[in-house]
């Protein structure tokens, strides 16, 4: 397994609708045709696998139908969007990129993007 550099923003604030987007950029050492992107979340001692997508260079990322993630790719950049976030989902979201094909296998892990999620205040009842 060979190492590869992955860059991602340090901090992102989710929108009031619970949507957060960030770019994950990897320094591809070769001409990979099959790339796998995984989003991991770390909060204290818990590390969970949030979502993953494999794509062929030049094609769209495909996440599972029930995934909370969507994304697009452009060259060595992946634009990731995570939706349905609530305050309890605040944490460090790590971008992991694997060049699956052709060999050799490369692995790159970003330093993580701290996503802050603030639940919107409920609208006060208004009398008309």
């Amino acid at each position: 397994c060979k190492a590869m550099h992955v860059a991602q923003p340090a901090v992102v604030l989710a929108s009031s609708r619970g949507i957060a987007s960030f770019v994950c950029e990897y320094a591809s050492p070769g001409k990979a045709t099959e790339v796998r992107v995984t989003v991991l979340r770390q909060a204290d001692s818990q590390v969970t696998e949030v979502c993953a997508a494999t794509y062929m260079m030049g094609n769209e990322l495909t996440f599972l139908d029930d995934s909370i993630c969507t994304g697009t790719s452009s060259g060595n950049q992946v634009n990731l969007t995570i939706q349905g976030l609530r305050a309890m989902d605040t944490g460090l979201y790590i971008c992991k990129v694997e060049l699956m094909y052709p060999p050799p296998y490369y692995l790159g892990i970003g330093n993580g993007t701290q996503i802050y999620v603030i639940d919107p205040e409920p609208c006060p009842d208004s009398d008309f």
Epitope: T38, S45, Q46, V47, T48, E49, V50, C51, I109
Partner: antibody, heavy 120, light 106 residues
Framework: EVQLVQSGAEVKKPGASVKVSCKAS????????MDWVRQAPGASLDWIGN????????SYNQKFKGKATLTVDKSTSTAYMELSSLRAGDIAVYYC?????????????WGQGTLVTVSS | QIVLTQTPLSLSVSPGEPASISCSAS?????MHWFQQKPGQSPKSWIY???ILASGVPDRFSGSGSGTDFTLKISRVEADDAGVYYC?????????FGTGTKLELK
Amino acid sequence: EVQLVQSGAEVKKPGASVKVSCKASGYTFTDYNMDWVRQAPGASLDWIGNINPNSESTSYNQKFKGKATLTVDKSTSTAYMELSSLRAGDIAVYYCTRDGNRYDAWFAYWGQGTLVTVSS
Amino acid sequence: QIVLTQTPLSLSVSPGEPASISCSASSSVTYMHWFQQKPGQSPKSWIYSTSILASGVPDRFSGSGSGTDFTLKISRVEADDAGVYYCQQRTSYPLTFGTGTKLELK
């Protein structure tokens, strides 16, 4: 070379407590979570919980809350799991385990296991 | 919690024949991870992130699947493959392992 060396087998009486140790070497102890897994005789593997040695924050499987307590001693690079109020159902081999890389190759390293026997 | 059910519970295979172990999750998981355990030994990481072979694992092994259904396959079983195989998920806590599949050689 990463090594996780656990304390030896224990025989305890019902109601007693036991503290199992896991001495880590070959890496920076505070860089990786330490997880604990139980295997009862002839049974599958059961995740007990884990501890972040840096922050000492813990996460437990609800099933083991109140039964297991995870701690670390950073000065000796040792993780501990204490089991309280032992009963026959706690007879098992207990393993400590660590990931291969940060965020990759989960549970790549395992201790040799510690057999805990409960007998009156 | 996510329950992982493995099938079959045990299988007996002749050397050189293929073998397949399934792991079904009670809800969708991102990846499945596999461990091999031999009697009296600690489990060993065997396949992680669904399809990546751990260091030293022969390429007769492969892993595949997505969502709730995952498979570990051996193209040609050898004597050293005997043992119990467990699947594991890391999509949500508590982390859970499968029920285990014992592979024996005929």
